[in-house]
Amino acid sequence: CPTSCKCSSARIWCTEPSPGIVAFPRLEPNSVDPENITEILIANQKRLEIINEDDVEAYVGLRNLTIVDSGLKFVAYKAFLKNSNLRHINFTRNKLTSLSRRHFRHLDLSDLILTGNPFTCSCDIMWLKTLQETKSSPDTQDLYCLNESSKNMPLANLQIPNCGLPSARLAAPNLTVEEGKSVTLSCSVGGDPLPTLYWDVGNLVSKHMNETSHTQGSLRITNISSDDSGKQISCVAENLVGEDQDSVNLTVHFAPTITFLESPTSDHHWCIPFTVRGNPKPALQWFYNGAILNESKYICTKIHVTNHTEYHGCLQLDNPTHMNNGDYTLMAKNEYGKDERQISAHFMGRPGVDYETNPNYPEVLYEDWTTPTDIGDTTNKSNEIPSTDVADQSNREH
């Protein structure tokens, strides 16, 4: 355990005034795993003045950080960069004169308690005023700052000229692009203090490069991948006070591909499972032994899960017999192209034949049995992928 602190498997606490700690507590090698620490409590540590960039990074599981009644004066910008689990920060009654929102912008904090710090009235802490104004009343804190006359002023009354939230505006073309093509987005930002502009492209797969010049920025996306369809691209303007963003959704059109087609499985119904990708939504057509398969209430396509441009479903068959054994071909088609895949399905052996011992019994002897059955009908119901009640369950995308 760090000197002058006590530890459990998930907690570190350093609360004794003397001799106290002069640096943020670090676990010794071969002691408790820092990743398991969820809470650090520091109190009465007047000689603890700084949290350095790498002091907290080992505590990746940290949820609660409390440093109260201590001497904290400075927190490095990247101090909490690796602590994405942090939810509660309490820096009550320390010596902080300034604190940037850059410390916390990547965190999903439930609490940030900062009362009793000698903040200097400046644009640097205007973000705290903005934060307070967006909080519901029970959560508000009595925050003060020292003005030029060294008088305590409520943060709620703070007025700093040329110190406001920035703005971002995207000038985007219609972001519906064909796979393999390129597109350029333009963004302009404004505000005082002058904001920085950056692009948030999330997990964009396609190659992209940006150029930024003062208040203007462009993002060029080349050889666009179908994997990026539905992804959001944001232009972000950020300054001391806060940030603004403007976003667009990327839609990529591409030819269908059948990524999965398997032999039938039996559950409540028989199912020939498939997965099809394509945008716009492909039309599906089944073929049985090379001829169009006309769907009916006994044999029909069901889509169970829709994941943006990917469709998981089944050709569902009610009580198929040996009459339905054969080759099934799925064709998926949209305006950009088509794809087809085939599987052989065997549902059951013929009557009077021990199929276990005669698996290759010549089907030609039974041609007279291939007249239409109640499983099919003569109407061609080929159409776009039908939506079903199964696809309407919660947690499904459409």
Partner: antibody, heavy 116, light 106 residues
Framework: QVQLLQSAAEVKKPGESLKISCKGS????????IGWVRQMPGKGLEWVGI????????RYSPSFQGQVTISADTSISTTYLQWSSLKASDTAIYYC?????????WGQGTTVTVSS | QSVLTQPPSLSVSPRQTASITCSGD??????VSWYQQKPGQSPVLVIY???KRPSGIPERFSGSNSGNTATLTISGTQAMDEADYYC?????????FGGGTKLTVL
């Protein structure tokens, strides 16, 4: 070396005020907590409270809250314990304690006698 | 405020081991210091942070703390160790002393 030098013994009447002192030397006075401890005749030790001279942050034990005031003057490296109205039950030896390694340095004690 | 309980007195023969206990609720979660006080003298810190010895304190003084009990052990007790011993811990940033144990070396 680190030393804490306390003011001389005091004899007072009930209702009078009093301020005793403790002067630190040989270490960075402002950077370490200083505590005051009471020992009544024939009894054990009791924490009165502690002060951090650099910012005058003061903590009192519950039984002494509102009864005494602890203060510090960093310019002369001195901390004080004062009463606005003494009682006979305040008769005791009062020690100050500080140091870089816990409270490892103690003053010699100031005997306060309150008697009518 | 928490209460620290010590035995009022303990007698030990020279060169024997003396163990003075100090008990309190979840005391192991706090740091315990031990002070020695001889008649007419100021207290002297002999153990701090459960187990640490300040410079100048003989090795025969040692400390431990877990659960609800802290212990000061004096191995090979000498006549000069006869004194009152006080345990001390911090509770909500104020100090708390035990009632003290009078150690008599027979």
């Amino acid at each position: 070396q680190v030393q804490l030098l306390q003011s001389a013994a005091e004899v007072k009447k009930p209702g009078e005020s009093l301020k005793i002192s403790c002067k630190g030397s040989g270490y960075r006075f402002t950077s370490y907590w200083i505590g005051w401890v009471r020992q009544m005749p024939g009894k054990g030790l009791e924490w009165v409270g502690i002060i951090y001279p650099d910012d005058s942050d003061t903590r009192y034990s519950p039984s002494f809250q509102g009864q005494v005031t602890i203060s510090a003057d960093t310019s002369i490296s001195t901390t004080y314990l004062q009463w606005s109205s003494l009682k006979a039950s305040d008769t005791a030896i009062y020690y100050c304690a500080s140091g870089e390694v816990a409270f490892d340095v103690w003053g010699q004690g100031t005997t306060v006698t309150v008697s009518s | 405020q928490s209460v620290l309980t010590q035995p009022p007195s303990l007698s030990v023969s020279p060169r024997q081991t003396a163990s003075i206990t100090c008990s309190g609720d979840k005391l192991g979660d706090k740091f315990v210091s031990w002070y020695q006080q001889k008649p007419g003298q100021s207290p002297v810190l002999v153990i701090y942070q459960d187990t640490k010895r300040p410079s100048g304190i003989p090795e025969r003084f040692s400390g431990s703390n877990s659960g609800n009990t802290a212990t000061l052990t004096i191995s090979g007790t000498q006549a000069m160790d006869e004194a009152d011993y006080y345990c001390q811990a911090w509770d909500s940033s104020t100090g708390v002393f035990g009632g003290g144990t009078k150690l008599t070396v027979l």
